[in-house]
Amino acid sequence: KSPVFGPQEVSSVEGNSVSIKCYYPPTSVNRHTRKYWCRKGASGRCITLVSSEGYVSSNYAGRANLTNFPENGTFVVNIAQLSRDDSGHYKCGLGINSRGLSFDVSLEVSQGPELPNGTEVYTVDVGRTVTIKCPFKTENAPKTKALYKKIGQTSVLVIDSRNYVNPNYKDRIRLRIPGTGQLIFTVVIDRLRLSDHGLYLCQAGDGSNRDEKNADLQVLEPEPELVYEDLRGSVTFHCALGLEVANVAKFLCRVNSRETCDVVINTLGKRDSAFEGRILLNPQDKDGSFSVVITGLRKEDEGRYLCGAHSDGQLQEGWPIQAWQLFVNEESTIPRSPTVVKGVAGGSVAVLCPYNPKESQSLKYWCLWEGAQNGRCPLLVESQGLVQEQYEGRLSLLQEPGNGTFTVILNQLTTQDAGFYWCLTNGDTRWRTTVEIKIIEGEPNLKVPGNVTAVLGETLNIPCHFPCKFSSYEKYWCKWSNTGCQTLPSQDEGPSEAFVNCDENSRLVSLTLNPVTRADEGWYWCGVKQGHFYGETAAVYVAVEEKKVAGSRYVSPAKADAAPDEKVLDSGVREIENKAIQDPRLFAEEKVVADTGDQAGGSRASVDSSSSEEQGGSSK
């Protein structure tokens, strides 16, 4: 007996898709061996149609695939655009077709039911509306019009022109008789249920002269669209339910083991706490369609999702729905990165954001998730250098370390900065990730003056104190602008004896501006890093004023003033929308911080440090 298991019989109709799931013992060998789907021929040989090694036969090209889920011990064969020629005997298996472990599957593709001559077929999704057209002759114009449902050998009256309505159709059916001259009446049934499925008979008049017309109503359950996404990645559910429900509350729910559907998010403001910080319901288009984005996918997010419309914002029978079956692949291409980053008030964080390494030229963004109503994510910074005004001087997006990761640095942290942030690009939308910033108790490791006033033409020296744990880190000063933070030339003095022993007086890296010019005004960052990986930063604002007194100025932390006033957030905040993800230029207009002018450089700015050793770890 083979340990491989699957459906023994699969039946469907022409044009449909099937998704055949085969189970195998998830031993190490089985997980990594070849998986296949083959068709048994008259000779007994089994001809491969699709395999896990990428082979797809010409008969299956463009309509079939095989996906292995090694962590579950399953693989799934999807076959679309079925025809009656696909009917036959197949095997799903592991290893070699002729002697591997396998399971026999019978696939039967039928044409659909035989119907009486002249039957009109109406194929409609559950929850939608159907209009059945019923023609009649002139002599039956004044006579009773009716719609019957055929159940077995009997006919049950559904509605007639004498105002009878079958209780099963109450409040969702109407019979329309047009004005004179039009020899057709219509029956409109709203909010179709699966139980409405079947053969109907239109009738006008009675006796041998009556007009009859058969109608076959096929009410379809939504075929769940199979969605395969990577662990830690992102999924977008696009939901188009039709104009009939354009103004009705929308929802996305997940079907649970009790066969009810738990609301994940709806337009009435409800949201499942398990999706806090990682879900957005994008606004509806005029046609009532909307989309839901979920980032930071977890294994437990797997399952059947339904989107729908109902005034209660939750699933109700007879209202339109769309369905998806989400699978989360644990063998993810998306690298692990911290989902929580901690910082202290006044300190900083450096967040690593993954992106698809094949899209190194894509624009990178960072946005702040806001949970109000359906959720929104105003952009704070992007790789082209635009930064929200309130983040001026304390936020920067760096392309480093590159090769699938960029860095976002946020400093001068306050408790208001706690929350969820999204990393995204204008490329592969599946690589959106979420990180939560938490503000914890503690003191910043790097100490700089709060505010510095420099005098034109003089020398300015700004100290940055760091603790012993950063002794082996690379230290730097940079001048912040809305396009990044330009590193200033370093004048390291080399390791002194005092520094090697981490002497109190040696834990200092200083920035010298000589002579001070107008262009030197702005934000400066002192930071530590290790290669291309950034650690903590501290920011100081340098204001430049006219000469009042002679001599150079040394500013110590004791003389630090308050930081300059924060600018107010502009109202035209950019948000993630369907269109915007594809084309960031489609975001709403936004005020940007003007470039702060020439970078400090040349021999005028120098960084003094008692160390030139490389950085040795993360400051987080």
Partner: nanobody, 126 residues
Amino acid sequence: EVQLVESGGGLVQAGDSLRLSCAASGRTFTTYVMGWFRQAPGKDREFVATITWSGSTNYKYYADPVKGRFTISRDNAKNTVYLQMNSLKPEDTAVYYCTSSTVVTDPRKLNEYAYWGQGTLVTVSS
């Protein structure tokens, strides 16, 4: 909630046939999986057959001991699933339970099913 009511059990001779029915009522519009498990006296409950569906596509799963003898089917309009049992053997004697769920990862695992009927007794005498 979903209610499941089994019927059709009884006493038959070895080699005879029997047809079990399971009618589902209540909130069945998200039900996509229905099946049968059985429990012989003094034994664990075991998988017999399951039918899962999606639109007009059906998938039928059977346990090895019943393959080729038992057939599972459903009537969508009546929210009913059937188990046609042919060539019955004494070892088929058990209480047969109908079960349903929205989605199951593995149809053979009984803990993946949300709802269970009270069971109907099938006795096959030799």
